[in-house]
C-alpha cells in the first residue's frame, strides 16, 4: 500500500507519458488520476514502467474498478496482466477473442499460469461453449490445452471445432478424453473420402470402438504402429488376424517389436496360433491348435 500524500507542485500528470518513469511510487499514486490511466491504458505498454511502478498502476485501477475492470481496460493491460491474481480475473467479463489473444500473447512462451487458466475459464464460460475460433486460439498458444480439460468439459466442444485440432494437440490426452473427442471427430469428418478421412481421424482413434476399426480395415488405410499402440485394448481384442493385417498393411511387420506391449500382447493371447503364423512374423502366445475358445463375457450376457 502506498500512503496518501499530496502531489508535489507541477508534477500532476496531464497524460500518461514517459516522464512518469522517473516518478517515485508515492508520486505516481498522488499525481496520476485513475480515470486518466484507464482511458490511456493503451499507452502504458509503450512506456518502460518499472515492475514496482506497475504495482502502483494496478492499485489505482483496483480502486477505480473494485467490481472488476471493464473490457476496454483489460484489452490494454499488456504486461500488467502478469500482476493480476486469479481472484482479480474472476471479476472480469471477457467476451472479445481479441482481448483473449492480447493477454495470452503476454504469457507466450511460458507455461499456463493460474492467471491464464482462470482467464480462459472465464472466457469459455462466458461464451457457453468452446467454439472453433476460441479453440484455434487456445491450442495455438497452448498445444496441450485440449487435454487439460475433463471429459465433461470436452463434451461442450461442438464437432465443428474439431477442425481446429492438430495431432500434437492430442499428445497428452488420455483414453477417457479421446472417448469423448472421437465421436465428435467422426461426425466432423464424415463427408471426407477414405484416405483424407483417415488422415484427419487418425489422431482421435484412441477413442474408436471395434466396429469402426473393422470398417477402417476394409479401406487400405495402412495405419502406423504408433497409432495402433494408442488404440483402446478393448477395441483391438475382437479384431481378427486378417483384420489387423488389413488395418496395418505394410506396417504389420512392426507387431513383432511390440509383441510384449499392450494392446498387441493382449490381442495375441486372443488369437489362434495358426492364424498368427500366417503373418510369418514369429508371433508367439496365441491359442494352441485344437483348443476351444469360450467367450465367457458373451456367456454372461446371454444368461
Amino acid at each position: 500500500e502506498v500512503e496518501k500524500t499530496a502531489c508535489p507542485s507541477g508534477k500532476k500528470a496531464r497524460e500518461i507519458d514517459e516522464s512518469l518513469i522517473f516518478y517515485k511510487k508515492w508520486e505516481l499514486e498522488a499525481c496520476v488520476d485513475a480515470a486518466l490511466l484507464a482511458t490511456q491504458m493503451d499507452r502504458v505498454n509503450a512506456i518502460p514502467f518499472t515492475y514496482e511502478q506497475l504495482d502502483v498502476l494496478k492499485h489505482k485501477l483496483d480502486e477505480l474498478y473494485p467490481q472488476g475492470y471493464p473490457e476496454s481496460v483489460i484489452q490494454h493491460l499488456g504486461y500488467l496482466f502478469l500482476k493480476m491474481s486469479p481472484e482479480d480475473i474472476r471479476k472480469w467479463n471477457v467476451t472479445s477473442l481479441e482481448t483473449l489473444k492480447a493477454l495470452l500473447e503476454v504469457n507466450k512462451g511460458h507455461e499456463m499460469s493460474p492467471q491464464v487458466a482462470t482467464l480462459i475459464d472465464r472466457f469459455v464460460k462466458g461464451r457457453g461453449q468452446l467454439d472453433k475460433d476460441t479453440l484455434d486460439t487456445l491450442t495455438a498458444f497452448y498445444p496441450g490445452y485440449l487435454c487439460s480439460l475433463s471429459p465433461e468439459e470436452l463434451s461442450s466442444v461442438p464437432p465443428s471445432s474439431i477442425w481446429a485440432v492438430r495431432p500434437q494437440d492430442l499428445d497428452t490426452c488420455d483414453p477417457r478424453q479421446l472417448d469423448v473427442l472421437y465421436p465428435k471427430a467422426r461426425l466432423a469428418f464424415q463427408n471426407m473420402n477414405g484416405s483424407e478421412y483417415f488422415v484427419k481421424i487418425q489422431s482421435f482413434l484412441g477413442g474408436a470402438p471395434t466396429e469402426d476399426l473393422k470398417a477402417l480395415s476394409q479401406q487400405n488405410v495402412s495405419m502406423d504402429l504408433a497409432t495402433f499402440m494408442k488404440l483402446r485394448t478393448d477395441a483391438v481384442l475382437p479384431l481378427t488376424v486378417a483384420e489387423v493385417q488389413k488395418l496395418l498393411g505394410p506396417h504389420v511387420e512392426g507387431l513383432k517389436a511390440e509383441e510384449r506391449h499392450r494392446p498387441v500382447r493382449d490381442w495375441i493371447l486372443r488369437q489362434r496360433q495358426d492364424d498368427l503364423d500366417t503373418l510369418g512374423l514369429g508371433l508367439q502366445g496365441g491359442i494352441p491348435n485344437g483348443y476351444l475358445v469360450l467367450d465367457l463375457s458373451m456367456q454372461e450376457a446371454l444368461s
Epitope: 518513469i21 522517473f22 516518478y23 517515485k24 511510487k25 502504458v44 505498454n45 509503450a46 512506456i47 518502460p48 514502467f49 518499472t50 515492475y51 514496482e52 511502478q53 499488456g78 504486461y79 500488467l80 503476454v106
Partner: nanobody, 120 residues
C-alpha cells in the same frame, strides 16, 4: 541483485557508430527492466535508453532516432546501438537495472562502465 559488465566503448569520429554490450549476471530473459545511463561532466547520470520485457522503451530526447536499445536472449546481452554519434555523446556509459523508478539515484547495481569518446 543483478551485476553487469559493460563493453564496446571507444574513440570514434563524429557521424560514426558504436555498439555497446552489457552482460548481466542472471538470465536476461527474466530481467524485467534494463537501461543505459551516461555520465559526462558532473555527478549526475542521465538515463539514455530503457527497455522492459513488456515492450516499453524510452529514449532521452538528445538520442532519439540515433540510438537503439535491444536485447539478444540467446547471447544473454543488452545492446545499445549508437549511430550518427556527436561530440556531446562523449561520456561514460553504464548499463543498469532500475530500482523503484528510473532515476539514477535509485540504481544500486552500477557496473564499471565503458567510455565513449566522440571526436569532431
Amino acid at each position: 541483485e543483478v551485476q553487469v559488465v559493460e563493453s564496446g566503448g571507444g574513440l570514434v569520429q563524429a557521424g560514426g557508430s558504436l555498439r555497446l554490450s552489457c552482460v548481466p549476471s542472471g538470465s536476461i530473459s527474466s530481467i524485467y527492466a534494463m537501461g543505459w545511463y551516461r555520465q559526462a561532466l558532473g555527478p549526475e547520470r542521465e538515463l539514455v535508453a530503457a527497455q522492459t520485457l513488456g515492450g516499453g522503451t524510452y529514449y532521452a530526447n538528445p538520442v532519439k532516432g540515433r540510438f537503439t536499445i535491444y536485447r539478444d536472449n540467446d547471447k544473454n546481452t543488452l545492446y545499445l546501438q549508437m549511430n550518427n554519434l556527436k561530440p556531446e555523446d562523449t561520456a561514460m556509459y553504464y548499463c543498469a537495472t532500475p530500482g523503484e523508478h528510473w532515476g539514477s539515484s535509485d540504481v544500486t547495481n552500477w557496473g564499471q562502465g565503458t567510455q565513449v569518446t566522440v571526436s569532431s
